[in-house]
């Protein structure tokens, strides 16, 4: 039989964007495999990613059942083949993850400007409502469906000819701003959840500039 002992997983890390949630850990396995379990604070341990040699496990299916719950995962290490185990009295080696509350911690993905429409001195900018893997009644919910008014968007906009930025905020997915007629503007948006203490802001959307064949223009 082998002499390489099994080792416990370490550096358990949650990677989550728009509720797509993956647990990652180290080390790359040598003569061992992993099984992951996930639980809510009050719930039972559910095994996932059985006997895997991967060092990540997609737990999205479990956390989307209730994104406001707090989850804990643990990674078990089992010897592969005829390798001795270091677990005492037959107890398997495992390591716990940090707690993870999807609603409070999932990263908000980079928003996308869906379209803009100019009418005289008014410019309407619409942010695409990203879909998540959270389901209700067999349909996938959008970020807005999940976060409601907790989610706001900040619009940064400026004249193409200058660098002075202005900002606007909305708790819907639309901005209606005053602009100078005949001027071209550039803008980007950022998603923000002001009530959060971590992961409050998304990265900025790609910059869009008027006159670059995006959206609909009306004089």
């Amino acid at each position: 039989s082998g002499t390489t002992n099994t080792v416990a997983a370490y550096n358990l890390t949650w990677k989550s964007t728009n509720f797509k949630t993956i647990l990652e850990w180290e080390p790359k396995p040598v003569n061992q495999v992993y099984t992951v379990q996930i639980s809510t604070k009050s719930g039972d341990w559910k095994s996932k990613c059985f006997y895997t040699t991967d060092t990540e496990c997609d737990l999205t299916d479990e956390i989307v059942k209730d994104v406001k719950q707090t989850y804990l995962a643990r990674v078990f290490s089992y010897p592969a083949g005829n390798v001795e185990s270091t677990g005492s009295a037959g107890e398997p080696l495992y390591e716990n993850s940090p707690e993870f509350t999807p609603y409070l911690e999932t990263n908000i993905g980079q928003p996308v400007i869906q379209k803009y429409e100019q009418g005289g001195t008014k410019l309407k900018v619409t942010v695409k409502d990203s879909f998540t893997l959270v389901r209700r009644n067999n349909t996938f919910l959008s970020l807005r469906d999940v976060f409601g008014k907790d989610l706001i968007y900040t619009l940064y906009y400026w004249k193409s000819s200058s660098s002075g930025k202005k900002t606007a905020k909305t708790n819907t997915n639309e901005f209606l701003i005053d602009v100078d007629k005949g001027e071209n503007y550039c803008f980007s948006v950022q998603a923000v959840i002001p009530s959060r203490t971590v992961n409050r802001k998304s990265t900025d959307s790609p910059v869009e500039c008027m006159g670059q064949e995006k959206g609909e223009f009306r004089e």
Epitope: Q37, D44, W45, K46, S47, F50, Y51, T53, F76, G81
Partner: antibody, heavy 121, light 107 residues
């Protein structure tokens, strides 16, 4: 159709080894775990271990650690289970069983017909 | 190892009867439990996976449910072809373990 065909019955002496084969057909061999389960005469089912055909990684029940070796030959879509240092209590029917899809990853949805191994002096 | 205590070990019922078998796990196994049917001289056959999901092609008279660490397997109306031994199996913890089996006979 999907099936697992096992090798024939074996009679072995105590202390010897036995190697049972299980040939898979009708599905993508590498995509499903394969398990070995045994059943002593008139007794219940006992899980022995698992092999991942795509990488050949194995995990065994502690009871069989050091005595069992599971291997696979991807060219023939065949898995093997070798049990050494046989004793009379190893007399049993040995089954290979396919692990189910990701939905039911550790449910055994397809079984071989079984191989009777008799250990007798 | 997780112990799966299956009861009764045997039962006798009439055709058309409702038959219930229980399996109790020695600790919480979530819904990671499967049920199998084994007829004499044959390999087992998967009937129910994840406690309550019917395997494709299995008659709807078979069903499964869970309450905590207690799992129930039900045949709503026993048929002659249901004469077999039934096993539960947990896969939430290594090693995978089976219940001791329940032999179902016709009265």
């Amino acid at each position: 159709q999907v099936q697992l065909v096992q090798s024939g019955a074996e009679v072995k002496k105590p202390g010897a080894s036995v190697k049972v084969s299980c040939k898979a057909s009708g599905y993508t061999f590498a995509n499903y775990y394969m398990h070995w389960v045994r059943q002593a005469p008139g007794q219940g089912l006992e899980w022995m271990g698992i092999i991942n055909p795509s990488g050949g990684i194995t995990v065994y029940a502690q009871k069989f650690q050091g005595r069992v070796t599971m291997t696979r030959d991807t060219s023939t879509s065949t898995v093997y289970m070798e049990l050494s240092s046989l004793r009379s209590e190893d007399t049993a029917v040995y089954y290979c069983a396919r692990g189910g899809s990701k939905v039911a990853a550790l449910a055994f949805d397809i079984w071989g017909q079984g191989t009777m191994v008799t250990v007798s002096s | 190892d997780i112990q799966m205590t299956q009861s009764p070990s045997s039962l006798s019922a009439s055709v058309g009867d409702r038959v219930t078998i229980t399996c109790q796990a020695s600790q919480d196994i979530s819904n990671s439990l499967n049920w199998y049917q084994q007829k004499p001289g044959k390999a087992p056959k998967l009937l129910i996976y994840d406690a309550s999901n019917l395997e494709t092609g299995v008659p709807s008279r078979f069903s499964g449910s869970r309450s905590g660490t207690d799992f129930t397997f039900t045949i709503s109306s026993l048929q002659p072809e249901d004469i077999a031994t039934y096993y539960c199996q947990q896969y939430n913890f290594h090693p995978l373990t089976f219940g001791g089996g329940t032999k179902v006979e016709i009265k």
